[in-house]
């Protein structure tokens, strides 16, 4: 006997109680493919999650994070607390970036400033907790007689500019 369930479209399930008739997925459930014998329970966007898109008969709900949090993982499986720029999230909460590191986003970790000298360049703008250093011309370009449209800033070690 041919399996009649294969004829059931997405959004339905094959109801064995009704001689393999395709029944619509009940509210708060879905089936994203045809031929299913059960419908999956819809995801609930509660707590730190908010609804981006409702659950339909053929697709699961899509969640986002409430203000002050951001998504992590596939399909926003977790919400992580935002921090300010110049901070990173630790087990003890949001902490300022250590000297010599920066974070220009509300998420992620503090990263070391660029070492301009590794590229043979000098520091044009100092780094801060929120911003990386800006590298300028190489020291060789600063030698007398070198043509430059604007006078370069003197080379110095990266450091915090006044906050």
């Amino acid at each position: 006997l041919q399996d009649l369930c294969s004829n059931c479209p997405a959004g339905t399930f094959c109801d064995n109680n009704r001689s393999q008739i395709c029944s619509p997925c009940p509210p708060n459930s879905f089936s994203s493919a045809g031929g299913q014998r059960t419908c999956d329970i819809c995801r609930q966007c509660k707590g730190v999650f908010k609804t981006r898109k409702e659950c339909s008969s053929t697709s699961n709900a899509e969640c986002d994070c409430i203000s002050g949090y951001h998504c992590l993982g596939a399909e926003c499986s977790m919400c992580e607390q935002d921090c300010k720029q110049g901070q990173e999230l630790t087990k003890k909460g949001c902490k300022d970036c250590c000297f010599g590191t920066f974070n220009d986003q509300k998420r992620g970790i503090c990263r070391p400033w660029t070492n301009c000298s590794l590229d043979g360049k000098s520091v044009l703008v100092n780094g801060t907790k929120e911003r990386d250093v800006v590298c300028g011309p190489s020291p060789a370009d600063l030698s007398p007689g070198a043509s430059s449209a604007t006078p370069p800033a003197p080379a110095r070690e990266p450091g915090h500019s006044p906050q």
């Epitope: 509210p27 908010k50 409702e54 008969s57 969640c63």
Partner: antibody
Framework: QSVEESGGRLVTPGTPLTLTCTVS????????MIWVRQAPGEGLQYIGF?????YTYYTNWAKGRFTISRTSTTVDLKMTSLTAADTATYFC????????????WGPGTLVTVSS | DVVMTQTPASVSEPVRATVTIKCQAS??????LAWYQQKPGQPPKLLIY???TLASGVPSRFSGSGSGTEFTLTISDLECADAATYYC??????????????FGGGTEVVFK
């Protein structure tokens, strides 16, 4: 639990208009809040909704000219570049069971666009 | 766009008869279909959603079936109070946050 629309009136073509939906007995932020319209003697037209996550969705013809927003107790429908074709009764409704199916409807408010 | 074609446009039946109204979607919408009843001068009333789920307070004389592109509303044991226009409506999400939550053209139920 109830829903009621207000702000419908006679306007001239091109005039912007904002309709307000006031609810009682439930929290707006927990539901899809939907706008639907019906021209005199015609069928129903779905405009769009704002969901419980504060996201807005619009039908293709409404996108750009209609804007749905909400406060804690009201839902607004802002309409721009109105023409005679926008003459209709505008309904506000609450979605049923976490969906964008209009379940609880207001009585509607009539907007007439005429010069 | 998703086009919802409703048939018939009008139906005339005696009291206690059974009325069947059909709704066809231009593409598969799973089971994302609702039925509404509207009487003159009143807002629509939700009867059925998710193709077959009866809304709160709706008599069991109303039933919905179908999936994919073909859907049916059945009103059995017709009463005078059922004289109204009936609409189907789909839920369908497109891209770029555009929705195709289209209503059918309506079916008027009158009595012989």
């Amino acid at each position: 639990q109830s829903v009621e629309e207000s702000g419908g009136r006679l306007v001239t073509p091109g005039t912007p208009l904002t309709l307000t939906c006031t609810v009682s007995g439930f929290t707006i932020s927990s539901h899809h809040m939907i706008w639907v319209r019906q021209a005199p003697g015609e069928g129903l037209q779905y405009i769009g909704f704002i969901n419980d996550g504060d996201y807005t969705y619009y039908t293709n013809w409404a996108k750009g000219r209609f804007t749905i927003s909400r406060t804690s107790t009201t839902v607004d429908l802002k309409m721009t570049s109105l023409t005679a074709a926008d003459t209709a009764t505008y309904f506000c409704a609450r979605g049923v069971d976490g969906t964008s199916y209009p379940g609880l409807w207001g009585p509607g408010t009539l907007v007439t666009v005429s010069s | 766009d998703v086009v919802m074609t409703q048939t018939p446009a009008s139906v005339s039946e005696p009291v206690r008869a059974t009325v069947t109204i059909k709704c066809q979607a231009s593409q598969s919408i799973g089971a994302d279909l609702a039925w509404y009843q509207q009487k003159p001068g009143q807002p629509p009333k939700l009867l059925i959603y998710r193709a077959s789920t009866l809304a709160s307070g709706v008599p069991s004389r109303f039933s919905g079936s179908g999936s994919g592109t073909e859907f049916t509303l059945t009103i059995s044991d017709l009463e005078c109070a059922d004289a109204a226009t009936y609409y189907c409506q789909c839920i369908y999400y497109g891209t770029d946050d555009v929705i195709y939550h289209t209503f059918g053209g309506g079916t008027e139920v009158v009595f012989k």
